[in-house]
Amino acid sequence: NFMYSKTVKRLSKLREYQQYHPSLTCVMEGKDIEDWSCCPTPWTSFQSSCYFISTGMQSWTKSQKNCSVMGADLVVINTREEQDFIIQNLKRNSSYFLGLSDPGGRRHWQWVDQTPYNENVTFWHSGEPNNLDERCAIINFRSSEEWGWNDIHCHVPQKSICKMKKIYI
Protein backbone atom coordinates (compact mmCIF):
# COMPACT_ATOMS: atom_id res chain seq x y z
CA ASN A 1 0.00 0.00 0.00
CA PHE A 2 1.54 3.28 -1.19
CA MET A 3 0.15 5.49 1.59
CA TYR A 4 1.27 3.05 4.27
CA SER A 5 4.85 2.90 2.98
CA LYS A 6 4.94 6.69 2.66
CA THR A 7 3.82 7.04 6.28
CA VAL A 8 6.44 4.53 7.46
CA LYS A 9 9.17 6.47 5.61
CA ARG A 10 7.92 9.73 7.09
CA LEU A 11 7.96 8.35 10.63
CA SER A 12 11.46 6.99 10.06
CA LYS A 13 12.68 10.44 8.96
CA LEU A 14 10.98 12.09 11.93
CA ARG A 15 12.74 9.69 14.29
CA GLU A 16 16.07 10.38 12.58
CA TYR A 17 15.60 14.15 12.84
CA GLN A 18 14.26 14.08 16.40
CA GLN A 19 17.68 14.13 18.06
CA TYR A 20 18.46 17.45 16.34
CA HIS A 21 15.03 19.09 16.49
CA PRO A 22 12.72 17.27 18.91
CA SER A 23 9.58 18.83 17.47
CA LEU A 24 8.67 19.77 13.90
CA THR A 25 5.67 21.75 12.68
CA CYS A 26 4.63 20.48 9.25
CA VAL A 27 2.15 21.49 6.58
CA MET A 28 0.99 19.70 3.48
CA GLU A 29 2.18 21.55 0.40
CA GLY A 30 -0.19 21.73 -2.55
CA LYS A 31 -2.73 19.04 -3.25
CA ASP A 32 -0.29 16.17 -2.98
CA ILE A 33 -0.43 14.50 0.42
CA GLU A 34 3.07 13.19 -0.30
CA ASP A 35 4.73 16.54 0.30
CA TRP A 36 5.06 17.78 3.86
CA SER A 37 7.24 20.79 4.53
CA CYS A 38 8.38 21.32 8.10
CA CYS A 39 10.15 23.78 10.35
CA PRO A 40 11.44 23.02 13.82
CA THR A 41 9.11 24.19 16.57
CA PRO A 42 9.13 27.16 17.38
CA TRP A 43 10.83 28.41 14.20
CA THR A 44 8.73 30.48 11.78
CA SER A 45 8.34 29.79 8.07
CA PHE A 46 8.32 32.01 5.01
CA GLN A 47 8.33 30.68 1.45
CA SER A 48 10.88 27.83 1.37
CA SER A 49 12.78 28.72 4.55
CA CYS A 50 12.58 28.48 8.35
CA TYR A 51 13.74 31.25 10.70
CA PHE A 52 14.81 31.27 14.33
CA ILE A 53 15.36 34.38 16.45
CA SER A 54 18.15 33.62 18.90
CA THR A 55 17.84 35.86 21.95
CA GLY A 56 21.17 34.76 23.45
CA MET A 57 23.83 37.44 23.07
CA GLN A 58 26.94 36.17 21.26
CA SER A 59 29.70 37.36 18.94
CA TRP A 60 29.14 37.04 15.19
CA THR A 61 31.34 33.93 14.89
CA LYS A 62 29.67 32.20 17.84
CA SER A 63 26.25 33.16 16.50
CA GLN A 64 27.06 31.55 13.15
CA LYS A 65 28.37 28.42 14.87
CA ASN A 66 25.19 28.26 16.95
CA CYS A 67 23.11 28.37 13.76
CA SER A 68 25.25 25.81 11.92
CA VAL A 69 25.04 23.28 14.76
CA MET A 70 21.26 23.37 14.20
CA GLY A 71 21.65 22.85 10.43
CA ALA A 72 21.15 26.54 9.64
CA ASP A 73 23.16 29.70 8.95
CA LEU A 74 22.93 33.29 10.04
CA VAL A 75 20.21 34.77 7.88
CA VAL A 76 20.90 35.66 4.25
CA ILE A 77 18.32 38.21 3.10
CA ASN A 78 17.53 37.96 -0.59
CA THR A 79 14.49 40.21 -1.05
CA ARG A 80 12.60 43.11 0.53
CA GLU A 81 9.65 40.74 1.08
CA GLU A 82 11.87 38.39 3.08
CA GLN A 83 13.13 41.26 5.24
CA ASP A 84 9.57 42.50 5.77
CA PHE A 85 8.63 39.04 7.04
CA ILE A 86 11.65 38.78 9.33
CA ILE A 87 11.14 42.14 11.03
CA GLN A 88 7.65 41.12 12.18
CA ASN A 89 9.37 38.86 14.72
CA LEU A 90 12.05 41.29 15.94
CA LYS A 91 12.08 43.64 18.92
CA ARG A 92 12.69 47.32 18.17
CA ASN A 93 15.09 47.81 21.05
CA SER A 94 17.37 44.93 19.95
CA SER A 95 19.93 44.34 17.22
CA TYR A 96 20.38 41.04 15.38
CA PHE A 97 23.35 39.64 13.47
CA LEU A 98 22.89 38.86 9.78
CA GLY A 99 24.97 36.33 7.84
CA LEU A 100 26.89 39.19 6.24
CA SER A 101 30.51 40.10 6.95
CA ASP A 102 33.53 41.87 5.52
CA PRO A 103 36.37 39.77 6.93
CA GLY A 104 39.19 41.72 5.30
CA GLY A 105 37.82 45.15 6.13
CA ARG A 106 38.03 46.10 2.45
CA ARG A 107 34.30 46.51 1.92
CA HIS A 108 34.05 43.15 0.16
CA TRP A 109 30.84 42.11 1.88
CA GLN A 110 30.07 38.40 1.69
CA TRP A 111 27.15 36.26 2.74
CA VAL A 112 27.98 33.27 4.93
CA ASP A 113 26.47 30.78 2.45
CA GLN A 114 28.43 32.28 -0.48
CA THR A 115 25.35 33.87 -2.04
CA PRO A 116 26.77 36.68 -4.21
CA TYR A 117 26.49 40.07 -2.51
CA ASN A 118 24.19 42.22 -4.64
CA GLU A 119 24.49 45.93 -3.93
CA ASN A 120 21.02 46.41 -5.47
CA VAL A 121 19.37 44.23 -2.81
CA THR A 122 20.74 45.74 0.38
CA PHE A 123 18.95 47.62 3.12
CA TRP A 124 21.66 49.63 4.85
CA HIS A 125 20.60 52.54 7.04
CA SER A 126 21.60 55.84 5.46
CA GLY A 127 25.29 56.52 6.01
CA GLU A 128 26.03 52.84 6.58
CA PRO A 129 28.31 50.97 6.35
CA ASN A 130 30.63 53.61 7.76
CA ASN A 131 33.64 52.01 9.48
CA LEU A 132 36.25 49.66 7.96
CA ASP A 133 36.85 48.14 11.41
CA GLU A 134 33.18 47.21 11.75
CA ARG A 135 33.13 44.03 9.74
CA CYS A 136 29.83 42.37 10.63
CA ALA A 137 26.27 43.40 9.80
CA ILE A 138 23.25 43.69 12.06
CA ILE A 139 19.65 44.62 11.44
CA ASN A 140 18.17 47.14 13.84
CA PHE A 141 15.44 49.76 14.16
CA ARG A 142 15.98 53.50 13.87
CA SER A 143 12.99 55.70 14.44
CA SER A 144 13.87 57.89 11.46
CA GLU A 145 14.25 55.00 8.99
CA GLU A 146 12.55 51.99 10.54
CA TRP A 147 14.46 48.71 10.04
CA GLY A 148 17.83 48.60 8.26
CA TRP A 149 21.37 47.27 8.36
CA ASN A 150 24.39 48.63 10.20
CA ASP A 151 28.03 47.54 10.37
CA ILE A 152 29.40 46.82 13.85
CA HIS A 153 32.38 45.17 15.52
CA CYS A 154 32.06 41.39 15.17
CA HIS A 155 33.06 40.59 18.75
CA VAL A 156 30.28 42.69 20.32
CA PRO A 157 27.55 40.25 21.47
CA GLN A 158 24.20 40.59 19.75
CA LYS A 159 21.06 38.57 19.24
CA SER A 160 20.87 36.79 15.89
CA ILE A 161 18.63 35.28 13.23
CA CYS A 162 19.16 31.75 11.88
CA LYS A 163 17.77 30.55 8.57
CA MET A 164 17.52 27.08 7.05
CA LYS A 165 15.71 25.50 4.14
CA LYS A 166 12.42 23.89 5.04
CA ILE A 167 12.68 20.22 5.96
CA TYR A 168 10.77 17.97 3.58
CA ILE A 169 9.51 14.64 4.86
Epitope: T61, S68, V69, M70, D113, K165, Y168
Partner: nanobody
Protein backbone atom coordinates in the same frame (compact mmCIF):
# COMPACT_ATOMS: atom_id res chain seq x y z
CA UNK B 1 29.67 15.94 19.65
CA UNK B 2 31.02 14.85 16.25
CA UNK B 3 34.74 14.06 16.09
CA UNK B 4 36.79 13.82 12.90
CA UNK B 5 40.20 12.39 12.07
CA UNK B 6 41.99 12.87 8.75
CA UNK B 7 44.65 10.53 7.37
CA UNK B 8 46.47 9.83 4.13
CA UNK B 9 48.66 12.91 3.81
CA UNK B 10 52.32 12.79 2.96
CA UNK B 11 55.19 13.97 0.78
CA UNK B 12 54.82 13.26 -2.94
CA UNK B 13 56.23 14.40 -6.27
CA UNK B 14 54.36 16.67 -8.65
CA UNK B 15 52.06 14.56 -10.81
CA UNK B 16 51.55 11.90 -8.13
CA UNK B 17 48.31 10.95 -6.39
CA UNK B 18 47.12 10.78 -2.79
CA UNK B 19 43.88 9.68 -1.18
CA UNK B 20 42.85 11.45 2.00
CA UNK B 21 40.39 9.85 4.41
CA UNK B 22 38.18 11.39 7.06
CA UNK B 23 36.81 9.10 9.78
CA UNK B 24 33.83 10.38 11.78
CA UNK B 25 32.69 9.23 15.20
CA UNK B 26 29.08 8.39 15.94
CA UNK B 27 26.37 6.73 13.90
CA UNK B 28 24.67 9.74 12.32
CA UNK B 29 27.27 10.54 9.65
CA UNK B 30 24.59 10.38 6.97
CA UNK B 31 22.95 13.49 8.46
CA UNK B 32 25.99 15.62 7.68
CA UNK B 33 27.29 17.28 4.55
CA UNK B 34 31.07 17.05 4.30
CA UNK B 35 33.70 19.46 3.05
CA UNK B 36 37.45 19.45 2.52
CA UNK B 37 39.41 22.65 3.11
CA UNK B 38 43.12 23.44 3.01
CA UNK B 39 45.46 25.97 4.54
CA UNK B 40 48.91 26.81 3.19
CA UNK B 41 51.42 28.58 5.47
CA UNK B 42 50.56 32.26 5.87
CA UNK B 43 47.31 31.91 3.89
CA UNK B 44 43.62 31.74 4.69
CA UNK B 45 41.92 28.39 4.98
CA UNK B 46 40.18 27.79 1.65
CA UNK B 47 37.42 25.58 0.31
CA UNK B 48 38.54 22.57 -1.76
CA UNK B 49 35.53 20.29 -2.25
CA UNK B 50 32.18 19.44 -0.70
CA UNK B 51 29.65 16.65 -0.91
CA UNK B 52 26.00 16.42 0.10
CA UNK B 53 24.85 14.00 2.78
CA UNK B 54 23.51 11.57 0.19
CA UNK B 55 26.66 11.81 -1.93
CA UNK B 56 24.63 12.87 -4.95
CA UNK B 57 25.86 16.48 -5.16
CA UNK B 58 29.42 17.79 -5.15
CA UNK B 59 31.20 21.14 -5.44
CA UNK B 60 34.86 21.89 -6.21
CA UNK B 61 37.09 24.96 -6.25
CA UNK B 62 38.06 25.77 -9.82
CA UNK B 63 41.76 24.96 -9.45
CA UNK B 64 41.11 21.31 -8.46
CA UNK B 65 38.29 20.48 -10.87
CA UNK B 66 39.16 17.43 -12.96
CA UNK B 67 42.00 16.46 -10.60
CA UNK B 68 40.30 15.95 -7.21
CA UNK B 69 37.28 13.76 -6.45
CA UNK B 70 35.30 13.88 -3.21
CA UNK B 71 33.31 10.84 -2.10
CA UNK B 72 31.80 9.30 1.00
CA UNK B 73 30.71 5.96 2.45
CA UNK B 74 27.87 6.48 4.90
CA UNK B 75 28.03 2.85 6.06
CA UNK B 76 31.65 3.31 7.10
CA UNK B 77 31.18 6.83 8.53
CA UNK B 78 33.95 8.04 6.26
CA UNK B 79 34.70 10.58 3.58
CA UNK B 80 37.48 10.71 1.01
CA UNK B 81 39.39 13.10 -1.20
CA UNK B 82 41.15 11.49 -4.15
CA UNK B 83 43.83 13.88 -5.39
CA UNK B 84 45.42 13.17 -8.78
CA UNK B 85 48.06 15.07 -10.77
CA UNK B 86 49.14 16.94 -7.67
CA UNK B 87 50.93 20.28 -8.08
CA UNK B 88 53.30 22.15 -5.74
CA UNK B 89 50.56 24.73 -5.17
CA UNK B 90 48.42 21.97 -3.60
CA UNK B 91 50.84 21.88 -0.65
CA UNK B 92 48.86 22.61 2.53
CA UNK B 93 47.30 21.13 5.62
CA UNK B 94 44.02 19.50 4.54
CA UNK B 95 41.03 19.51 6.88
CA UNK B 96 37.70 17.69 6.66
CA UNK B 97 34.62 19.29 8.13
CA UNK B 98 31.00 18.31 8.75
CA UNK B 99 27.76 20.23 8.84
CA UNK B 100 24.32 19.04 9.93
CA UNK B 101 21.79 19.35 7.11
CA UNK B 102 18.27 18.20 6.41
CA UNK B 103 18.73 18.59 2.66
CA UNK B 104 20.04 15.55 0.81
CA UNK B 105 21.31 17.66 -2.09
CA UNK B 106 23.21 20.65 -0.64
CA UNK B 107 27.01 20.66 -0.75
CA UNK B 108 28.19 23.66 1.27
CA UNK B 109 31.18 25.75 0.20
CA UNK B 110 31.48 28.30 3.04
CA UNK B 111 34.01 27.44 5.74
CA UNK B 112 31.86 29.13 8.39
CA UNK B 113 29.00 26.80 7.50
CA UNK B 114 30.90 23.88 9.05
CA UNK B 115 30.99 23.69 12.86
CA UNK B 116 32.88 20.38 13.14
CA UNK B 117 36.54 20.07 12.06
CA UNK B 118 39.34 17.54 12.14
CA UNK B 119 42.91 18.31 13.16
CA UNK B 120 44.23 18.20 9.59
CA UNK B 121 46.74 16.17 7.59
CA UNK B 122 49.80 17.62 5.85
CA UNK B 123 50.16 17.27 2.09
CA UNK B 124 53.48 18.35 0.58
CA UNK B 125 54.03 18.27 -3.18
CA UNK B 126 57.62 18.76 -4.33
CA UNK B 127 58.58 19.79 -7.82
Amino acid sequence: QVQLQESGGGLVQAGDSLRLSCAASGNTFSMYAMGWFRQAPGKEREFVAAISRSGGSTNYRDSVKGRFTISRDNDLNAGYLQMNNLKPEDTAVYYCALRLTFSTTDAYTGKLQYPYWGQGTQVTVSS
